[in-house]
Interface confidence: medium
């Protein structure tokens, strides 16, 4: 949950190209104004995933998900909350 | 704001070579399964995508990191 | 009941063009990627293009590369392979197979065949 | 590119005998292996997907094993109707075919 907070477009994006759909790429991809030549990209990886199979995306997704709540990240999730919380409080 | 630990991750999925990649998973997950697959899914990437694929594809995640949506 | 049925084949001399057809029926057309895979007399299979499920993505073996036009219309329900510049050695039974959803199972099922022969 | 080497090229099998084909990749293709099951003067029809997953309505005798760079398609038990061509296919960057194993009836 909060990885996907951190940065929601992007891990939309991740799981539509890992998920194999296309359809549910070109959403996501819209939502950021892709161009043809961007969505053509996008398109190539998502190939790679759909050609490998559902055991290839389960585990790449496992990789996405480890790094994204990693200390490397939480840590400076907690470190973003502390910030905000403190421009919060001096805001007040 | 995207974790530097998944841009890094990206970036190299993208730019760098099949070893740096796999290198920079195993500091996360070190199962061999999943280095195994994540050395396919590169190769496959680098395979398929020419340069100007990987400049559009970055310059998608500029889009996507710079969003208001992140 | 999954129907594909391959059609345009037949003799055009070195340097011809030729376009094959594909007419899918008894599934969804738009949902699956497509293949074409063509067989010489006697010979394995070769596989020479697909193509995404909207048309997006397209791949071709670097034997037709530049030569071969994958494209598809939903709509219709139709495959199609533009084949320019014919070669004699790409003489074969050019088949149309599909994929299962997303991929999850390249050619399950497969059409007849047509026969292209390049020859003068 | 990668490349399918399958072996035997040929087999000549005596019915209820065990066939084993092997596929080796030229470099590692996790599971993104197939097996096609090729009789004359008809299409290739999937036997199994995915290295080790059978196709709905392939006979049980038809298994698959294998991940990276070996793979074995094994009939358990040959009947006639098993001489064939068979074919493996890899699936993990674009695509490409092995040679073909033919396998004869005694």
């Known amino acids: 949950v909060k990885m996907a907070e951190t940065c929601p477009i992007f891990y939309d994006v991740f799981f539509a190209v890992a998920n194999g759909n296309e359809l549910l790429l070109d959403l996501s991809l819209t939502k950021v104004n892709a161009t043809e030549p961007e969505r053509t990209a996008m398109k190539k990886i998502q190939d790679c995933y759909v050609e490998n199979g559902l055991i290839s995306r389960v585990l790449d997704g496992l990789v996405m998900t480890t790094i994204s709540s990693s200390k490397d990240c939480m840590g400076e999730a907690v470190q973003n909350t502390v910030e905000d919380l403190k421009l919060n409080t001096l805001g007040r | 704001e995207i974790c530097p630990a998944v841009k890094r991750d990206v970036d190299l999925f993208l730019t760098g070579t099949p070893d740096e990649y796999v290198e920079q998973v195993a500091q996360y997950k070190a199962l061999p399964v999943v280095l195994e697959n994540a050395r396919i899914l590169k190769n496959c990437v680098d395979a398929k995508m020419t340069e100007e694929d990987k400049e559009n594809a970055l310059s998608l995640l500029d889009k996507i990191y710079t969003s208001p949506l992140c | 009941e999954v129907q594909l049925v391959e059609s345009g084949g037949g003799l055009v001399k070195p340097g011809g063009s030729l376009r094959l057809s594909c007419a899918a029926s008894g599934f969804t057309f738009s949902d699956y990627y497509m293949n074409w895979i063509r067989q010489a007399p006697g010979k394995g299979l070769e596989w020479v293009s697909y193509i995404s499920s909207s048309g997006s993505s397209i791949y071709y073996a670097d034997s037709v590369k530049g030569r071969f036009t994958i494209s598809r219309d939903n709509a219709k329900n139709s495959l199609y392979l533009l084949m320019n510049s014919l070669r004699a050695e790409d003489t074969a039974v050019y088949y149309c197979?599909?994929?299962?959803?997303?991929?999850?199972?390249?050619?399950?099922?497969w059409g007849q065949g047509t026969l292209v022969t390049v020859s003068s | 590119e990668i490349v399918l080497t399958q072996s035997p090229d040929f087999q000549s099998v005596t019915p209820k005998e065990k066939v084993t084909i092997t596929c080796r990749a030229s470099?590692?293709?996790?599971?993104?292996l197939h097996w096609y099951q090729q009789k004359p003067d008809q299409s290739p029809k999937l036997l199994i997907k995915?290295?080790?997953q059978s196709f709905s309505g392939v006979p049980s005798r038809f298994s698959g094993s294998g991940s990276g760079t070996d793979f074995t398609l094994t009939i358990n038990s040959l009947e006639a109707e098993d001489a064939a061509t068979y074919y493996c296919l890899q699936s993990s960057s674009l695509r490409t075919f092995g040679q073909g194993t033919k396998v004869e009836i005694k």
């Open positions: 197979a599909r994929d299962g959803k997303y991929n999850s199972s390249p050619g399950d099922y």
């Open positions: 470099q590692s293709i996790g599971g993104s």
């Open positions: 995915y290295a080790s």
